[in-house]
């Protein structure tokens, strides 16, 4: 007779990524008896919460419960009921909430309190909601991609199970771009990390890693755009801002009060003789690039070398996975292929930004105009950040891999966060055990 499979002995975990522009819920699954093995945890579901990021619920925190309902109910459906009580739920809030906390700790605490109260109402094992640091965000993103790429495994393979795998144990660097911050994390080559704030030491699966990380608050794509607008309106002669980062023919009215709402624009704030101004797109990549470069202060560096704004950055080393908005933007622009050189990317951006707005709207009729209008800026910003901010070159560009998913799991900080909080990444290499034969009888 045929072998009959026993019920799977699996575990689940839930992580909510409360980003500046939206919240996503991720459900992870792994075999219970292989908890300490590398690469066994995989994502089974992503649910994007409808609406903005949680920091936008200031003055309406009473709506947070409803906001989270659909995705939490989805988790209830996906995870077997018998597993609900032992499934941990974590919520990590990132730069949107860091910015809110800078403005008012009371408001940020209130948002988190209501989030905690809402999540506690579900049958899962709720483990808390907190604002993670930029350093954690970088570190957990690095852990995620290297875990999924099999970089922590001691077994060398003659075949490649994942794309980008170079079949060595050298880790990938992680480049993460959000709406409000961006992170760069990698293992430098025999280089002292000159600023202690940027140094992390890990021992994972019996190996030591000295990791460099930095999170640039206010340099996520959305906050960078606000910064650029606040900088450029300072020198506008009237309430018209002719903006090279938007397509020719594009027009949008911006409230000055919205512009100065974020702490990220405080350095550019001034009394303007108008309460609104109109962006008029002129679609010029080169001018847009130049405008963006003015956001990076490269004139001051107290270390042997810096990224920008006086932040230490060691020489780049090895391959990098660029994910989150790095991937989403470049994917939209069709620029994620390994074969596309940096020069080609720049050429394509020049062409894209120069396309008239009416033409763009027709070509991408299914895309929301708010998002569609910002791809020229976002693509140009990504190039500026990587080339001038982080000092990638035309040659080292080929070491950047724009990654959405690895083995079906999203690249991002959430998996690393859960692996750490559930103690699933041992410091030492687990003793190899005989293959389990408990799956069949």
């Amino acid at each position: 007779t045929q072998n009959k499979a026993l019920p799977e002995n699996v575990k689940y975990g839930i992580v909510l990524d409360a980003g500046s522009s939206h919240t996503s819920l991720y459900i992870y699954k792994w075999p219970a008896e292989k908890e300490n093995d590398t690469g066994v945890v995989h994502q089974v579901e992503e649910c994007r919460v409808k609406g903005p990021g949680i920091s936008k619920f200031v003055q309406k925190v009473n709506e947070i419960g409803i906001y989270l309902t659909d995705c939490m109910e989805r988790a209830r459906e996906v995870i077997p009921r018998s597993q609900h009580q032992e499934t941990p739920v974590y919520l990590g809030a990132t730069a949107g909430m860091r910015l809110l906390r800078m403005e008012s700790e009371e408001l940020a605490d209130r948002v988190l309190d209501v989030v905690e109260r809402s999540l506690s109402n579900y049958p899962f094992d709720f483990q808390g909601a907190r604002i993670i640091t930029g350093q954690e965000e970088g570190a957990y993103g690095w852990i995620t991609i290297n875990y999924l790429l099999g970089k922590f495994s001691q077994k060398t393979r003659w075949f490649s199970i994942v794309p980008y795998e170079t079949n060595n144990q050298e880790t990938f660097g992680a480049l993460d771009l959000g709406g409000a911050s961006t992170q760069v994390t990698f293992v430098p080559q025999n280089q002292t990390i000159e600023s202690p704030d940027n140094a992390l030491q890990f021992r994972l699966y019996g190996k030591d890693y000295n990791v460099y990380t930095h999170s640039f608050l206010c340099y996520g794509k959305d906050q960078a755009l606000w910064q650029k607008l606040a900088k450029d309106i300072q020198v506008a002669s009237n309430e018209i801002l002719r903006d090279p980062c938007f397509h020719p023919g594009y027009k949008k009215v911006v409230n000055v009060s919205d512009l100065y709402k974020t702490p990220c624009t405080k350095r550019f704030e001034m009394t303007l003789p108008f309460q609104q101004f109109e962006i008029q797109g002129i679609g010029n990549y080169q001018q847009c690039h130049q405008s963006i470069l003015e956001l990076f202060n490269t004139s001051y560096c107290p270390y042997s070398q810096c990224a920008f704004n006086g932040i230490f950055l060691p020489p780049l080393q090895g391959d990098f996975g660029a994910f989150s908005a790095f991937y989403f933007v470049m994917k939209f622009l069709n620029l994620t292929s390994e074969k596309v050189s940096q020069e080609k990317v720049t050429e394509m951006m020049k062409k894209f930004c120069a396309q008239p707005w009416e033409e763009i709207k027709t070509s991408y009729a299914g895309v929301k105009e708010k998002y569609l209008s910002e791809y020229c800026f976002s693509g140009t910003y990504i190039l500026s950040l990587l080339l001038q901010g982080y000092h990638f070159t035309a040659d080292s560009w080929e070491h950047i891999h724009f990654i959405g998913k690895i083995q079906g799991s999203d690249a991002g900080w959430t998996l690393g966060y859960m692996l750490n909080l559930t103690n699933m990444i041992p410091a030492e290499q687990p003793l190899s055990t005989p293959l389990s034969h408990s799956t069949y009888v």
Partner: antibody
């Protein structure tokens, strides 16, 4: 102490526009929303909607969609109510009221002194 | 819309008495009910939130009770300065609504 001070009484003709101000003091303006409430002569109170002073988001009750507009001047800690194309039935006292979070929900804890608007030809 | 009904438009009482003002919601509003006092020519003053919680500075003689659809504002040991109109208000659902008001007269 917390105060909401509204602009003075207005006498307007039908079809004209009126803009009422509500200046807040004694607290951080952008940490609390602002409600607007109408009270017609001899009548009860009618909630018109509220403005989120942090995000600028507007919420109007159905009866006040169209001719009514809430706005802000954050730097001056001031909220505004503008009524366009005034009608006789807009004759009322208009109150601003702070939207504050108490015990898991939002209430109107402090009120302005009210602005009387009379519409008459 | 949720209708808040204050069935008694006027109530007459004497100084030192205890009086109860009632309010009925057309739908369940939980405890998301507030009470306001409005004296002639003045703006409303917040007395009670969350059905039974007194704002700081509000005298202890004002108490609120109820949940669901039936709510009561009780004034024990009525004082002459309590001469005013009292409004209930639900903030459970948009649009927020008020009761029609109950005028308290002092004999």
């Amino acid at each position: 102490q917390i105060q909401l001070v509204q602009s003075g009484p207005e006498l307007k003709k039908p079809g004209e526009t009126v803009k009422i101000s509500c200046k807040a003091s004694g607290y951080t303006f952008t940490h609390y929303g602002m409600n607007w409430v109408k009270q017609a002569p001899g009548k009860g109170l009618k909630w018109m909607g509220w403005i989120n002073t942090y995000t600028g988001e507007l919420t109007y009750a159905d009866d006040f969609k169209g001719r009514f507009a809430f706005s802000l001047e954050t730097s001056a800690s001031t909220a505004y109510l503008q009524i366009n194309n005034l009608k006789n039935e807009d004759t009322a006292t208009y109150f601003c009221a702070r939207r504050a979070y108490y015990r898991y929900d939002y209430v109107m804890d402090y009120w302005g002194q009210g602005t009387s608007v009379t519409v008459s030809s | 819309d949720i209708v808040m009904t204050q069935s008694q438009k006027f109530m007459s009482t004497s100084v030192g008495d205890r009086v109860s003002v009632t309010c009925k919601a057309s739908h369940n509003v939980g405890t998301n009910v507030a009470w306001y006092q409005q004296k002639p020519g003045q703006s409303p003053k917040a007395l009670i939130y969350s059905a039974s919680y007194r704002y700081s500075g509000v005298p202890g003689r004002f108490t609120g009770s109820g949940s669901g659809t039936d709510f009561t504002l009780t004034i024990s040991n009525v004082q002459s300065e309590d001469l005013a109109e009292y409004f209930c208000h639900q903030y459970n659902n948009y649009p927020y609504t008020f009761g029609g008001g109950t005028k308290l007269e002092i004999k």
